[in-house]
């Protein structure tokens, strides 16, 4: 009886098992019982990354600099181009189809995790004893100045956005 299923790296066509084309090659013509599957290498800027029966190779991804993208890894006949973002930007999706600027942490918040090529900045509110008075994508919350270590006293209490203000000891005391 004709086959109803085929081995790995084969496909069923016209009641016959034909070899799939290897990664980096596309299908030109199906096998017959007299000749094997005819495959051709993908052209420049094309790829196929699996054993396949595709009649057209896929185009390599274009890393559009207008979208903040650059090439992280050049594509081959078997792999797609991998894009990443320019410094200071990160991908908007796993596929990295476009980039956005890293989000800065506003005053009162500091950087808990710095942004990467694929993730945005993670901010945290500055806890008591810490402050941030700038909008930054890399500054952490800074500890309030310790007036005591400078032989000074607190003249104005700190907040999550401002440092304490130190002043001289009251000389009358």
């Amino acid at each position: 009886e004709p086959p109803t299923a085929c081995r790995e790296k084969q496909y069923l066509i016209n009641s016959q098992c034909c070899s799939l084309c290897q990664p980096g090659q596309k299908l030109v013509s199906d096998c017959t019982e007299f000749t094997e599957t005819e495959c051709l290498p993908c052209g420049e800027s094309e790829f196929l990354d699996t054993w396949n029966r595709e009649t057209h190779c896929h185009q390599h991804k274009y890393c559009d600099p207008n979208l903040g993208l650059r090439v992280q890894q050049k594509g081959t006949s078997e792999t797609d181009t991998i894009c990443t973002c320019e410094e200071g930007w990160h991908c908007t999706s796993e596929a990295c189809e476009s980039c956005v600027l890293h989000t800065p942490c506003i005053p009162g918040f500091g950087v808990m995790e710095m942004a990467t090529e694929t993730t945005d900045t993670v901010c945290e509110p500055c806890p008591v004893g810490f402050f941030s008075n700038v909008s930054s994508a890399f500054e952490k919350c800074h500890p309030w100045t310790s007036c005591e270590t400078k032989d000074l006293v607190v003249q104005q209490a700190g907040t999550n956005k401002t440092d304490v203000v130190c002043g001289p000891q009251d000389r009358l005391r």
Epitope: N14, T32, E33, T35
Partner: antibody
Amino acid sequence: EVQLLESGGGLVQPGGSLRLSCAASGFTFSSYAMSWVRQAPGKGLEWVSGIGSYGGGTYYADSVKGRFTISRDNSKNTLYLQMNSLRAEDTAVYYCARYVNFGMDYWGQGTLVTVSS
Amino acid sequence: DIQMTQSPSSLSASVGDRVTITCRASQSISSYLNWYQQKPGKAPKLLIYAASSLQSGVPSRFSGSGSGTDFTLTISSLQPEDFATYYCQQYGRNPPTFGQGTKLEIK
């Protein structure tokens, strides 16, 4: 024991026709692709035509396309080659062969076709 | 069609010799190549399939190698019954095509 026996060869005038037969025995004929291969006197082998198993497709060399027709009768375990519009360059020994995994593992003894006026 | 070119066209050798016949395809055929042996007045016999696999019943002194466009048939130690004509045949593209043959004669 696998056996292939060709018949139907002979002398024919240019433009004439002949039908070759190949009687198969010793195997399940319908399960195998079959082909015809020819060999002109003192020359090499030339694949002429093939027919798939289970009534599969038919295939021809460019040199015979449109003139030769391959067919099979699985109920009679017989392969045929209908040859029309014969030319002097078709003169050859014609072999039928069984196909397995893209190779011809069993061949008949051949039948001689002579095209001459 | 794919052209198959064998070399040499003929060669003389002695019993016990190691003999190599080459076959070149006009374009890449991966490992889709068979070798046949034909003796005068007889039908061809399949020796090697898929470039390097020995057909059942064929002596192990016969071996095949190669892929892409260049292939070889090697007989490690010639026996008297090996004097014959050898043909390569590709099945990478339709139609299947044969080389012109290599005639192996006794020296």
